[in-house]
């Protein structure tokens, strides 16, 4: 039972529509068939779980219906998208990967992606 390395980009800027995407890549030491991916957010000395999904290798990630996250997997990479972000959601988003099956259990936690969210300026009234 060991730790594994998880890589993710240092910084991502959310789109004007409040959508941020980043890749979470893990160095799988074995042939995992069941993987759990959790996105954590650290801000103001507090860590909260943003979303989590368990998937079988080769299948799509399935988040809860009301989740703000979506994602796809390809080999040892997970492409994560977080939507509905506002400026107050700016923070460090951390990718946590667990290889659940078969044993042994492996755990890896990335260094985090700082996501910056800038609320769009409201459009000025126009006569046109």
């Amino acid at each position: 039972c060991k730790a594994m390395h998880v890589a993710q980009p240092a910084v991502v800027l959310a789109s004007s529509r409040g959508i941020a995407s980043f890749v979470c890549e893990y160095a799988s030491p074995g042939k995992a068939t069941e993987v759990r991916v959790t996105v954590l957010r650290q801000a103001d000395s507090q860590v909260t779980e943003v979303c989590a999904a368990t998937y079988m290798m080769g299948n799509e990630l399935t988040f809860l219906d009301d989740s703000i996250c979506t994602g796809t997997s390809s080999g040892n990479q997970v492409n994560l998208t977080i939507q509905g972000l506002r400026a107050m959601d700016t923070g460090l988003y951390i990718c946590k990967v667990e290889l659940m099956y078969p044993p042994p259990y492996y755990l890896g936690i990335g260094n985090g992606t700082q996501i910056y969210v800038i609320d769009p300026e409201p459009c000025p009234d126009s006569d046109f």
């Epitope: 039972c1 060991k2 730790a3 594994m4 998880v6 959790t38 954590l40 650290q42 000395s45 507090q46 860590v47 909260t48 779980e49 946590k96 667990e98 755990l107 890896g108 936690i109 990335g110 260094n111 985090g112």
Partner: nanobody, 130 residues
Amino acid sequence: EVQLVESGGGLVQPGGSLRLSCAASGYTYSRHCLGWFRQAPGKGREAVSTISSGGSTSYADSVKGRFTISRDNAKNTLYLQMNSLRPEDTAVYYCAIGPNPRYCSGAPQTRGAEHYFGYWGQGTLVTVSS
């Protein structure tokens, strides 16, 4: 398989001392974070103290100056020396391993820091009461 086994808990009077131990096996990663957490009845788990693989230590404000964390690498054992115990220290104490040392020093000042740890012992109960 990783195993963490805590011991040393018990009933102690206010102002007394206890030394908790956590014997670890099955974990071979060299760069990691070891921590002590506690969970009082009806409350969430909170980080008490952490120690990095390099030996840097960190403490929650509520235990600073009273608790001391240490490790014996030769014995694969983590310790928590608890002095000047108070009734509010009553809780189940857990040791844990975190795989990323980046989050080690800040854990005792961070709510929800348990998310950074993935391997847990079964816990040992500490009761401070007269």
